[in-house]
C-alpha cells in the first residue's frame, strides 16, 4: 500500500435517460482513485458487454468511464439496452458503485390500433370520430388534421378527449378529410383518412 493511494469514489453519477430507438446516448460515469480505477457497467446485475469485449458492439466504454451507445437497440421482443444501469469503479483498494440510472427507450410504432372511419351526419347533428394511435412510449398525444391543416380545437363545438373527436353541432363547413395524428418525442404518425360528410 503506497501512502498516496486511495480507493475509488464516484465523482459523476449517471442520470436517468429517455432516448429514441436508433439514436445515440451516453450514460456518464467518472471516478477518482489511485491507482486509476477500472470502470465496468452492469445492467440488472449482468455485466454490460462493450466494444472491449466485441469490436462489433454498439456500446463503447469511453476513456472517461462513460458508456456510449452508438444507437439504442430496441425491437418488438428484444430490448437489450433498456433497463437500470450502474457503473462500478475498482482498484486494488476497493470498489465504488454509482447510483442507479434507468435508460428508457422512446418508441412510436407505425400501425394505428384503430383508424378513424367515415362519418355521415345531418347539419346540426353531433359527429364523432375515433382513433387509437400506435403504441408508443411516452404515450403518444393525439391531435387531428382537417384537409391537411391542424384542427382548430379552440372552436367550442369541438372536443378532443383521448382518441375521440366530437363535434357537438356540425356545420356544412366541417365536411372534409380528417386524419388522426399520434405524436411523441420520436415523431408523429398519421392515420388513414376518414371523410366527414355533412348533409343539408
Amino acid at each position: 500500500l503506497r501512502q498516496e493511494d486511495f480507493p475509488p469514489r464516484i465523482v459523476e453519477h449517471p442520470s436517468d435517460l429517455i432516448v429514441s430507438k436508433g439514436e445515440p446516448a451516453t450514460l456518464n460515469c467518472k471516478a477518482e482513485g489511485r491507482p486509476t480505477p477500472t470502470i465496468e457497467w452492469y445492467k440488472g446485475g449482468e455485466r454490460v458487454e462493450t466494444d472491449k469485449d466485441d469490436p462489433r458492439s454498439h456500446r463503447m466504454l469511453l476513456p472517461s468511464g462513460s458508456l456510449f451507445f452508438l444507437r439504442i437497440v430496441h425491437g418488438r421482443k428484444s430490448r437489450p439496452d433498456e433497463g437500470v444501469y450502474v457503473c462500478v469503479a475498482r482498484n486494488y483498494l476497493g470498489e465504488a458503485v454509482s447510483h442507479n440510472a434507468s435508460l428508457e427507450v422512446a418508441i412510436l410504432r407505425d400501425d394505428f390500433r384503430q383508424n378513424p372511419s367515415d362519418v355521415m351526419v345531418a347539419v346540426g347533428e353531433p359527429a364523432v370520430m375515433e382513433c387509437q394511435p400506435p403504441r408508443g412510449h411516452p404515450e403518444p398525444t393525439i391531435s387531428w388534421k382537417k384537409d391537411g391543416s391542424p384542427l382548430d380545437d379552440k372552436d367550442e363545438r369541438i372536443t378532443i378527449r383521448g382518441g375521440k373527436l366530437m363535434i357537438t353541432y356540425t356545420r356544412k363547413s366541417d365536411a372534409g378529410k380528417y386524419v388522426c395524428v399520434g405524436t411523441n418525442m420520436v415523431g408523429e404518425r398519421e392515420s388513414e383518412v376518414a371523410e366527414l360528410t355533412v348533409l343539408e
Epitope: 445492467k43 421482443k77 430490448r79 437489450p80
Partner: antibody, heavy 118, light 105 residues
C-alpha cells in the same frame, strides 16, 4: 464472440419427448428473445415459438401449443425446448435463434438433429 | 396467421446474373421483413433486416426493397458462393416463406 451452442443429435421413439438445449455466450442473455425454428429433411423453415429470457414468458403458434415447452436458466444462460408426444414427422433439425433489436434472427445455433423412429 | 408466399420456388442462373426473388405477405406487415441465406447442412444466415437494411458483413451485391405486402431480394451480380436457398421471414408475428433455391444454370 457471440454464439449459440446446441446439444447433440437425438434418436427417439414415437410418443417419447426430447429436450434440446441452447447455450448462449458473448452477450446479455436476458436482453434478447430466443426463438426455436425447425427444418424437416428437404423442407423449409418452420417457426416453433419464442421465450423472453427475462420473464420466462413464451408464445407458440397454434400448431405446437400443448406439445412444446420452452424454458430457460438465466444462471447458465441456456434456453431449452421440450417437444412431447413425438411423431415421425417431427424428424427435423431444430435450431435456436436470437432475435436482434432489429426484429431479425441474427445469431443461430448450429442445429440439433432429432430423429423419431420406431 | 400471416402467410408468406415466395416466388419462384427455384431458379437457374449463371455467375454474373442479376437475380430477383419476391415475397408477398397475406396482410400488411410494414417493413417487418427479413431475408436469410441457407446452404446445405448449415444454419440460415441473416442477409437483410427491416426490408432493406444490409446485415453487418454481408456483401453489398445483396439488397432488399418493399413495404406493406410486397418485398424483393436482389442479388446484383451472382457469385459462385451465392448458390443457396433463400428465405423471407416476417417478424410482425413471425413466419417464413417457403424458400427459393438458386441453382447453377
Amino acid at each position: 464472440e457471440v454464439q449459440l451452442v446446441q446439444s447433440g443429435a437425438e434418436v427417439k421413439k414415437p410418443g417419447a419427448s426430447v429436450k434440446v438445449s441452447c447455450k448462449a455466450s458473448g452477450y446479455t442473455f436476458r436482453g434478447y428473445a430466443m426463438h426455436w425454428v425447425r427444418q424437416a429433411p428437404g423442407q423449409g423453415l418452420e417457426w416453433m415459438g419464442w421465450i423472453d429470457p427475462r420473464t420466462g414468458l413464451t408464445k407458440f403458434p397454434q400448431k405446437f401449443q400443448g406439445r412444446v415447452t420452452m424454458t430457460r436458466d438465466t444462471s447458465i444462460t441456456t434456453a431449452y425446448m421440450d417437444l412431447s408426444r413425438l411423431r415421425s414427422d417431427d424428424t427435423a433439425v431444430y435450431y435456436c435463434a436470437r432475435e436482434s433489436g432489429d426484429d431479425a434472427f441474427d445469431i443461430w445455433g448450429q442445429g440439433t438433429m432429432v430423429t423419431v423412429s420406431s | 396467421d400471416i402467410v408468406m408466399t415466395q416466388s419462384p420456388s427455384s431458379l437457374s442462373a449463371s455467375v454474373g446474373d442479376r437475380v430477383t426473388i419476391t415475397c408477398r405477405a397475406s396482410q400488411k406487415i410494414s417493413s417487418y421483413l427479413n431475408w436469410y441465406q441457407q446452404k446445405p447442412g448449415k444454419a440460415p444466415k441473416l442477409l437483410i433486416y427491416a426490408a432493406s437494411s444490409l446485415q453487418y458483413g454481408v456483401p453489398s451485391r445483396f439488397s432488399g426493397s418493399g413495404s406493406g405486402t410486397d418485398f424483393t431480394l436482389t442479388i446484383s451480380s451472382l457469385q459462385p458462393e451465392d448458390f443457396a436457398t433463400y428465405y423471407c421471414q416476417q417478424s410482425y408475428s413471425t413466419s417464413f416463406g417457403g424458400g427459393t433455391k438458386v441453382e447453377i444454370k
